[in-house]
């Protein structure tokens, strides 16, 4: 019996088509992805093949103005329109709190939303009961398929799930649910979830009875043969894991941002064994036309976004210096504002011993593309912020050794004076440079804000200690020559859309007046 699994993950509000790098579409003839194009391809496959499932492995939320404005209603609406069969909860589905998940998505979705390792307690338990499920048995043709969901147990550190949701270990939580499916005579089981490729592989290895793993969170691109675009495969598609009980379990992921549609064909025998698995992600490029009815719907929803862009978010009573003459040479108050917003966006009081789990921010000065003049009645709009942060990036959470941070700050000034973008703006860090010294030896003082303290204060950086840092995804991926970050990071979790982080902070503060205060000397 042959099953076709179509899958997406980490779509992050890319409802409209995007450019090849998943930023705003400029030249339509070269744009990719978007729900209208996705629908065309999904329908094409549904018409051609008998047993098809369309699955999403989480993180539909967060990433563009679509989410900022519609807050998840857009996800429910367009996923319903595409007739998704199931979705797993990702960490970003909790970005607007549990209410921001329940009302727009859980209550509106016409497909099951799954996670076996999230357990509700207290007053939330009855409120959320039945709105998401540990597993769902889906009829597919003459057969039935069990889908079990899972979500990163790091979610409390990455989003805002509140205190009434407990995130359990994925493997521990999945096994009894899979066992339950087996007792219900369901022998074809897909684990669909959002914990990253390493955990996907562990689930394939450790959870008895899981036949296929469809994952997300790590934006992993897998491909067999010559890849069709710029993404470099982390392995073959599907990636085959040998389970502890001796079965070959295919593991798949489909990069991110709706650029590809994962396409996996599985042949099962009567016992539910995977006899064969093959496929590849399908690049959703302009050779696939956008479905006209979905496109018309997108255009209708788009109107509200254009209005939102010019509305006031808050006010500044000082000039926000985002000029390259400042931000690439010295501490600039735009850099301070952005870093303060990045830390504020990551306030998570999950442990009494820590005032917060992260205190540090670094930001490449070259990523700040425009100042904001306070003389326009102090008004700050989304449009203004889009000029400052035009690249559609995210502010991510990484774990780095102190020694890596020291290398990063040396790189920051290794060719100082040439107006290059690698000069770092900071938050929760005091750095002193001596530019008379030779490159690679210019950092003379590097103090960082403590986290395991009730009164935050600055302590010298320890080379062997592991620190959490918020930074742009551009830096996490080694951009502006920060190869040491990419090579040496111990953990990387993608965060919220850059503009959204800053706009939320400004809306919260109402009036801002960031200063230059001696963070960089």
């Amino acid at each position: 019996w042959e099953l076709t699994i179509l899958h997406t993950n980490d779509v992050h509000s890319r409802l409209e088509q995007t450019s090849e790098d998943s930023s705003k579409c400029v030249n339509a003839s070269r744009c990719m992805g978007g729900v209208a194009r996705l629908f065309t391809k999904v329908q094409q496959i549904r018409r051609a093949e008998p047993n098809v499932l369309l699955l999403d492995a989480g993180d539909q939320y967060q990433g563009t103005i679509w989410f900022t404005v519609y807050k998840g209603a857009e996800v429910a609406h367009f996923m319903n329109a595409l007739r998704y069969d199931a979705m797993a909860l990702g960490n970003h589905e909790f970005d607007n709190g549990v209410e921001g998940l329940i009302e727009p998505l859980l209550k509106e979705a016409k497909f099951p939303i799954l996670s076996a390792n999230i357990k509700a307690k207290g007053p939330l338990a009855s409120q959320i009961s039945g709105l998401y499920l540990p597993y769902k048995v889906l009829p597919v043709g003459d057969e039935v398929v069990g889908i079990v969901g899972y979500t990163s147990k790091e979610t409390p550190f990455l989003s805002n799930p509140g205190t009434n949701l407990v995130f359990e270990d994925e493997i521990t939580a999945l096994q009894p649910e899979v066992d339950k499916l087996k007792t219900l005579n369901v022998n074809k089981i897909i684990a669909l979830g959002h914990s990253g490729f390493e955990m996907d592989k562990l689930i394939a290895q450790k959870v008895r009875g899981v036949d296929v793993v469809v994952g997300g969170h790590s934006n992993t691109f897998l491909y067999t043969g010559n890849p069709p675009s710029k993404e470099v495969p982390a392995g073959k598609y599907p990636f085959i894991v040998t389970s502890d009980d001796g079965r070959k379990v295919p593991v798949v992921q489909a990069y991110a941002f709706g650029k590809y549609l994962g396409y996996l064909k599985i042949e099962f025998d009567e016992r539910g064994n995977v006899i064969s698995s093959h496929g590849n992600p399908i690049l959703l490029n302009s050779s696939i036309p956008e479905d006209p009815s979905i496109k018309a719907d997108i255009n209708k929803w788009r109107i509200k976004l254009d209005n939102y862009s010019t509305q006031e978010l808050g006010k500044t009573i000082v000039y926000l210096d985002g000029s390259s003459q400042s931000c690439r040479f010295r501490e600039c108050n735009m850099g301070n504002l952005i870093c303060d917003a990045m830390i504020n966006n990551n306030l998570r009081h999950t442990d009494e011993m820590f005032w917060n789990h992260v205190s540090m921010c670094i930001l490449n000065g070259g990523g700040i593309r425009s100042p904001i003049d306070e003389r326009n009645n102090g008004t700050i709009t989304w449009e203004n912020l889009a000029a400052v942060l035009p690249f559609g990036g995210t502010f991510d959470l990484v774990q780095l050794k102190g020694s890596t941070l020291k290398k990063a700050f040396e790189h920051s000034v290794h060719r100082y004076g040439q107006s290059t973008g690698e000069f770092l703006q900071v938050g929760g860090i005091h750095v002193v440079y001596d530019l008379s010294r030779k490159p690679g030896d210019r950092v003379v003082k590097l103090d960082v804000l403590c986290t395991k303290c009730r009164v935050p204060s600055y302590d010298p950086l320890k080379m062997d200690e592991v620190y959490k840092v918020i930074l742009p995804n551009f830096l996490a991926n080694g951009g502006d020559g920060f190869q040491m970050i990419k090579d040496e990071l111990l953990r990387h979790d993608s965060g919220d859309q850059d503009i959204n982080v800053v706009s939320t902070y400004i809306s919260k503060m109402k009036v801002i007046y960031p200063a230059v205060e001696g963070r960089i000397k």
Epitope: D142, E143, V144, T242, G246, E270
Partner: antibody
Framework: EVQLVQSGAEVKKPGASVKVSCKAS????????MNWVRQAPGQGLEWMGR????????FYSQKFKGRVTMTVDKSTSTVYMELSSLRSEDTAVYYC???????WGQGTTVTVSS | DIQMTQSPSSLSASVGDRVTITCRAS??????LNWLQQKPGKAPKRLIY???SLDSGVPSRFSGSGSGTEYTLTISSLQPEDFATYYC?????????FGGGTKVEIK
Amino acid sequence: EVQLVQSGAEVKKPGASVKVSCKASGYTFTAYFMNWVRQAPGQGLEWMGRIYHNNGDTFYSQKFKGRVTMTVDKSTSTVYMELSSLRSEDTAVYYCATSYVGDWGQGTTVTVSS
Amino acid sequence: DIQMTQSPSSLSASVGDRVTITCRASQDIGDSLNWLQQKPGKAPKRLIYATSSLDSGVPSRFSGSGSGTEYTLTISSLQPEDFATYYCLQYASFPWTFGGGTKVEIK
């Protein structure tokens, strides 16, 4: 649990036909295939062909084409294999086996003798 | 048709021995290979499917490997109940074809 139950032993004369049945249970019958495999005394296994339960599509090994007919009765989840123009070398145990031979019937002994 | 050449046709071994049986296909069959065990008077039983996946209930001392045209069944430590005849089966293309069998006997 998958179960395949075959009809009883048959003794046939050369030139006659034999029809062996295989009743399946424990799985979604219409979604799969059934194979027929035979084993002559003291010999190895020989694949004869397969039938798709849902629509009756068949694929026969060239060696048996024209002599073998596989049919399906969806209402009773039963598959049949008929072999005609029997000769002494068709004396064998005939097995039905699921799609990828994960489960087998108990076998039906067919003896061709004058 | 794809020919499956199985070797050896028979072998004698003792309990605890490591046993290796090989199947060579006349052309590339991908991963489309099963290993079956048959005891006298019984129907065959599948041990391994898709080259290396172990059927449920089959002891972990059985393992399969290979690719392209060369495939191997290994019994890491032969047990008394393992004395039987073993067959490979390719299902890459019709007609499916079995190897000639390997009889594993007690030394």
